[in-house]
């Protein structure tokens, strides 16, 4: 599946995402995953994301958004984290959204 | 299966110097941080500090900051920790752990480290 | 640092007893914490992370809960591989810190 370009694994039960993910789908552009159990990003999660221009991640569990996670994503337009737990406005440690 | 293999045991002299290795199969240590954690005999745990395998940079508790240098070799997918200085305070079993979010899900059997004269 | 306050410090249950372990901060760490369990002469197994989220694997007989400074870690059911110290663990800061630990018996 190196060709992908669109994945929508939204309404499951995913819990942990391994960052491996997008190493094995460097084309990826659409990343779905509203509905899931997330409770956390790192600046790891998406690192080999450097694709991404839309990322879906309402209605998960994400509290915690340890040190700057989307600092890769140079092409992003749309990023969707709501209904989730933040409790600030703040992704990060740093400005990472251009 | 991840697997974090650390091996044998060390005997040090004081004021010597010990490197201790951390070789992960299952899992690429570039998408995630490698920890040192240690535990004096019948103690609790003491963290030591992390390192970033993808670009080196490392995270140390206050009291390991001139005790303690972590290294990590991607192409072997390994993590190092030197020991300087040793004293019998350093006596420990010492863990490498992974953990992308600062706590650990995966750790080492451990190595014993001893400094004796 | 961030202190981690863990009591009991030690605890003996019968089978099928429920337990519960306490871990106070010294500051509030939002949720920012993991309970460990170490068997004998064993490396520590994470249980519970982000406070109350089971790892893959543990059995629900374990869970977490708490805020703020508070957090408990409850066995419902114990079993006598449950019989192990037990840590809880914050990472909200750095420098990463533990509590002192709980030394679970069976009575």
């Known amino acids: 599946y190196s060709q992908l370009t669109s994945l929508d694994v939204g309404f499951n039960t995913i819990s942990k995402l391994e960052p491996e993910l997008c190493q094995k789908l460097p084309m990826l552009k659409v990343l779905n995953l509203q509905h899931n159990e997330l409770s956390q990003l790192s600046d790891k999660t998406f690192a080999f994301c450097t694709n991404l221009t839309e990322l879906h991640l309402m209605s998960n569990s994400i509290q915690k958004i340890k040190n700057n996670p989307f600092v890769k994503q140079k092409n992003l337009i749309t990023l969707d984290l709501s209904h989730n737990g933040l409790s600030s406005t703040k992704l990060g440690t740093q400005v990472q959204l251009e | 299966e991840v697997q974090l293999q650390q091996y044998g045991a060390e005997l040090g002299k004081p004021g010597t110097s010990v490197k201790l290795s951390c070789k992960v199969s299952g899992y690429n240590i570039t998408y995630t941080y490698m920890h040192w954690v240690n535990q004096r005999p019948g103690k609790g745990l003491e963290w030591i500090g992390r390192?970033?395998?993808?670009?080196?940079?490392?995270i140390y508790g206050e009291k390991f900051k001139n005790k303690a240098t972590l290294t990590a070799d991607t192409s072997s997918n390994t993590a190092y920790m030197q020991l300087s200085q040793l004293k019998s305070d350093d006596t420990a079993i010492y863990f490498c752990?992974?953990?992308?979010?600062?706590?650990?899900?995966?750790w080492g059997q451990g190595v014993m480290v001893t400094v004796s004269s | 640092d961030i202190q981690m306050t863990q009591s009991p410090a030690s605890l003996s249950a019968s089978l099928g007893e429920t337990v519960s372990i306490e871990c106070l901060a010294s500051?509030?760490?939002?949720?920012?914490l993991a309970w460990y369990q170490q068997k004998s002469g064993k490396s520590p197994q994470v249980l519970i992370y982000?406070?109350?989220r089971l790892e893959d694997g543990v059995p629900s007989r374990f869970s977490g809960s708490g805020s703020g400074t508070r957090y408990s870690l409850k066995i419902s059911g114990m079993q006598p591989e449950d019989e192990a110290d037990y840590f809880c663990q914050q990472s909200y800061k750095y420098p990463v810190t533990f509590g002192s630990g709980t030394k679970l018996e069976i009575k």
């Open positions: 752990a992974m953990g992308e979010f600062d706590y650990f899900d995966h």
């Open positions: 982000a406070a109350s």
């Open positions: 500051e509030d760490i939002s949720n920012d």
């Open positions: 390192i970033d395998p993808a670009n080196g940079n490392t």
